[in-house]
């Protein structure tokens, strides 16, 4: 039961994390205008990975996509790549982990296969989370370097946007979910892998005993190979909505 819970929770946490990574990647507020040095602005600038936006204090917002590919900074391209790799790996991991869930029965799939799939999805989630964290961190580092660079004009200095914090949290959740899946994998291993032959050396000759009266406990719950699981599958619904706000100007 503990294995199922760990696996299920790992799946849900990873699902939320990947939804967050997708949201962060699509959001426009990766960097925002430095309002500390320009607190009276009536025009608020903010940028995402795919477009830059201007919100006027009148409430009108205009966004323009980055229509060039070669003209963009290499760092921005690298961050885009990291986030996309994170999303792709996460999506594949989710697909694999759905089939690996103990509460879902697919034909006569062996526990060993489910264990392998759980481990695979766990590793994918870990790498996905690391990609997102790396991407967001690279972007944040770029902003911080520009902010403290005396050669960069004040008007061009940018602050860390909300998307970065969403990305860090989402990457962290995906990473945690992946770790949980890897932990669950250890408890999913079939019975045979749980018992080890124990060798005793007595009075000059060797006698091997294979214990049959007890099971070596892994500490991750009892073996449930022959039990029916009736746990309901978790469903999550993530809606990401963005509304313009005038509070960005003062």
């Amino acid at each position: 039961m503990a294995v199922t819970a760990c696996q299920g929770l790992g799946f849900v946490v990873s699902l939320i994390g990947i939804a967050g990574i997708i949201a962060a990647t699509c959001m426009d507020q990766w960097s925002t205008q430095d309002l500390y040095n320009n607190p009276v602005t009536a025009v608020f600038n903010y940028q995402g990975l795919w477009r830059s936006c201007v919100r006027e204090s009148s409430g009108f917002t205009e966004c323009r996509g980055y229509f060039t590919l070669l003209g963009l900074p290499a760092m921005l391209q690298a961050v885009r790549a990291l986030m996309i790799v994170g999303i792709v790996l996460g999506a594949i991991g989710l697909l694999v982990s759905i089939f690996a869930l103990k509460c879902i029965r697919i034909g006569s799939m062996e526990d060993s296969a489910k264990a392998n799939m759980t481990l695979t999805s766990g590793i994918m989630f870990i790498v996905s989370g690391l990609c997102a964290i790396a991407g967001v961190s690279v972007f944040a580092n770029m902003l911080i370097q520009d902010f403290y660079n005396p050669l960069v004009a004040e008007a061009l200095k940018r602050e860390l946007g909300a998307s970065l914090f969403v990305g860090w949290v989402a990457g962290g959740l995906t990473l945690i979910g992946g770790v949980m899946m890897c932990i669950a994998c250890r408890g999913l291993a079939p019975e045979e892998t749980n018992y080890k032959a124990v060798s005793y050396h007595a009075s000059g000759h060797s006698v091997a005993y294979k214990p049959g009266g007890f099971k070596a406990s892994t500490g991750f719950g009892s073996n449930t190979k022959n039990k029916k699981i009736y746990d309901g599958g978790a469903r999550t619904e993530d809606e990401v909505q963005s509304y313009p706000s005038k509070h960005d100007y003062v």
């Epitope: 205008q33 009276v40 009536a42 025009v43 600038n45 201007v54 009148s58 409430g59 008007a155 509070h247």
Partner: antibody
């Protein structure tokens, strides 16, 4: 069509506060900022401040911070500007305007002529 | 606060003539995010409230005759009336819409001979 209706004139005694009104019609009142502009006789224009009717968020020109208070009544789609302790310096035409693209003011009320006199 | 300086303070022209008036700001009104200048031109006829002519320094408001043209960038702006009509008799104001408080120029009074 969009209209901003203001009373033509107000007479107030020095020191007695006055509340000027601006009734909006022909558009969604809560979606656009309302600005107030002062014009003294034969003089230029001065921006007093603005208010976002949806949540009454305000910005003020520091010069008028202690003089003007902007409010709205969403139910009647009316914006108000209260002037405290008016003096002869406050005698002017006060316009309410609506914010538009480029933070410009696309619609203007006809203006209220405020006379401060004893 | 951004200071807006208009020149000349008044000018007299004959109908059909081309006229230009200047507006200078103490700080740049160019926004790097969209490369737009946050400067607006208004026309105020005697006894009337101001009327929006041009925003973003060069974008004509709908219904404004195309003889009115706004140009300039950064701190120097110009309003041009290609062929002045009798009904253009008014005071023309420029306004900073880039940062609070929004500030107006002192105006250019256009008179027709």
């Amino acid at each position: 069509q969009v209209q901003l209706q203001q009373p033509g004139a107000e007479l107030v005694r020095p020191g007695a506060s006055v509340k000027l009104s601006c009734k909006a019609s022909g558009y969604t009142f809560t979606s656009y900022w309302i600005n107030w502009v002062k014009q003294r006789p034969g003089q230029g224009l001065e921006w007093i401040g603005n208010i976002y009717p949806s949540d009454s968020y305000t910005n003020y020109n520091q010069k008028f911070k202690d003089k003007a208070t902007l409010t709205v009544d969403k139910s009647s789609s009316t914006a108000y500007m209260q002037l405290s302790s008016p003096t002869s310096e406050d005698s002017a035409v006060y316009y309410c305007t609506r914010s538009w693209r480029g933070n410009s003011f696309d619609y203007w009320g006809q203006g209220t002529t405020l006379t401060v006199s004893s | 606060d951004i200071v807006m300086t208009q020149s000349p303070s008044s000018l007299t022209v004959t109908a059909g003539e081309k006229v230009t008036m200047s507006c200078k700001s103490s700080q740049s009104l160019l926004n790097s995010g969209n490369q737009k200048n946050y400067l607006t031109w208004y026309q105020q006829k005697p006894g009337q409230p101001p009327k929006l002519l041009i925003y973003w320094a060069s974008t004509r408001e709908s219904g404004v005759p195309d003889r009115f043209t706004g140009s300039g960038s950064g701190t120097d702006f110009t309003l041009t009336i290609s062929s002045v009509q009798a009904e253009d008799l008014a005071v023309y104001y420029c306004q900073n819409d880039y940062s609070y408080p929004f500030t107006f120029g002192s105006g250019t009074k256009l008179e027709i001979k």
